[in-house]
Interface confidence: medium
């Protein structure tokens, strides 16, 4: 069976301040079992933006019903964008375990923030 891929189709997304940004992410397989997390930045200093399993992310909503067992779309919408939200966002698949371990990352989507139109 072909190994799971994490696909972030948009290399970059530009959003006006105050609007919502949609960051697309799909996976190509249901295996291995485990959650998706979104991060801003890469490496040890990356920042957790959304965790499918737990956490408090009031500005982040999932575009599809990500809790459904057969779901393969893990796109998110971030509301009320500000300049501080600019950066590269990575959709990361984890393998279920104790603790969950990182399995594969998407290529990243760069979010740029435009000034609010006057």
């Amino acid at each position: 069976e072909e190994e799971l891929q994490v696909i972030q189709p948009d290399k970059s997304v530009s959003v006006a301040a105050g609007e919502s940004a949609i960051l697309h992410c799909t996976v190509t397989s249901l295996i291995p079992v485990g959650p998706i997390q979104w991060f801003r930045g890469a490496g040890p200093a990356r920042e957790l933006i959304y965790n499918q399993k737990e956490g408090h992310f009031p500005r982040v909503t999932t575009v599809s019903e990500s809790t459904k067992r057969e779901n393969m779309d893990f796109s998110i919408s971030i509301s009320n964008i500000t300049p501080a939200d600019a950066g590269t966002y990575y959709c990361v698949k984890f393998r279920k375990g104790s603790p969950d371990t990182e399995f594969k990352s998407g290529a990243g989507t760069e979010l740029s923030v435009r000034a609010k139109p006057s």
Partner: antibody, heavy 119, light 108 residues
Framework: DVQLVESGGGVVRPGESLRLSCAAS????????MNWVRQAPGEGLEWVSR????????DYADSVKGRFTISRDNSKNTLYLQMNSLRAEDTAVYYC????????????WGLGAPVTVSS | ETVLTQSPATLSVSPGERATLSCRAS??????LAWHQQKPGQAPRLLIY???NRATGIPDRFSGSGSGTDFTLTISSLQTEDSAVYYC??????????FGGGTKVEIK
């Protein structure tokens, strides 16, 4: 009820080190970004440092960069601030503050830990 | 960096009267502005977030307004327990998170 209790403050000489702790309870500590904010005697509030919920992302005010290190132990629900090479101008009450969201306001504050740097 | 300027530095108001505090940002911060209250010898407490939303448990005599660069905190009928320093905080650009210099509200 959300509770943030700082400890570890005290009186030190310039150049010495101190580690502050902030014990958190009443909320899912591991889900929230946390901050340190300080207030010098008779002065306003100055943001010092921030750490994201997982502990990977950190930010510092220019005035403490390279001297202070923020960290957290999510298994102990505790936030830390390691302060090295302390200076007289670091004298302040240090507050830990919970962040509502990863890019948002501070919704709860601790009671504060006084730090005095004096020769 | 965004600078927040609060005015006046001190405000002296009689009980029952209205107190109006101003916070001006050097560049737009959208609606990403909070107000914190700090009573003498106490830690700060969140009053208002996103410019106009009252935090949990905050009496409705406190209200916030404004967007962009000009913001106002209004205490509609001042109570003696409202004697405190009030700070605005922006979270539109960071780091660093910035606070205003504070407005001290005194009871006449």
């Amino acid at each position: 009820d959300v509770q943030l209790v700082e400890s570890g403050g005290g009186v030190v000489r310039p150049g010495e080190s101190l580690r502050l702790s902030c014990a958190a309870s009443g909320f899912s500590f591991r889900s929230y970004a946390m901050n340190w904010v300080r207030q010098a005697p008779g002065e306003g509030l100055e943001w010092v440092s921030r750490i994201d919920s997982g502990g990977g992302g950190t930010d510092y005010a220019d005035s403490v960069k390279g001297r202070f290190t923020i960290s957290r132990d999510n298994s102990k629900n505790t936030l830390y601030l390691q302060m090295n090479s302390l200076r007289a101008e670091d004298t302040a009450v240090y507050y830990c503050a919970k962040q509502y969201d990863w890019n948002s306001f501070f919704d709860y504050w601790g009671l504060g830990a006084p730090v005095t740097v004096s020769s | 960096e965004t600078v927040l300027t609060q005015s006046p530095a001190t405000l002296s108001v009689s009980p029952g009267e209205r107190a109006t505090l101003s916070c001006r940002a050097s560049q737009t911060v959208g609606s990403k502005l909070a107000w914190h209250q700090q009573k003498p010898g106490q830690a700060p407490r969140l009053l208002i977030y996103d410019a106009s939303n009252r935090a949990t448990g905050i009496p409705d005599r406190f209200s916030g307004s404004g967007s962009g660069t000009d913001f106002t905190l209004t205490i509609s009928s001042l109570q003696t327990e409202d004697s405190a320093v009030y700070y605005c905080q922006q979270y539109y650009y960071w780091p660093p998170y910035r606070f205003g210099g504070g407005t001290k509200v005194e009871i006449k």
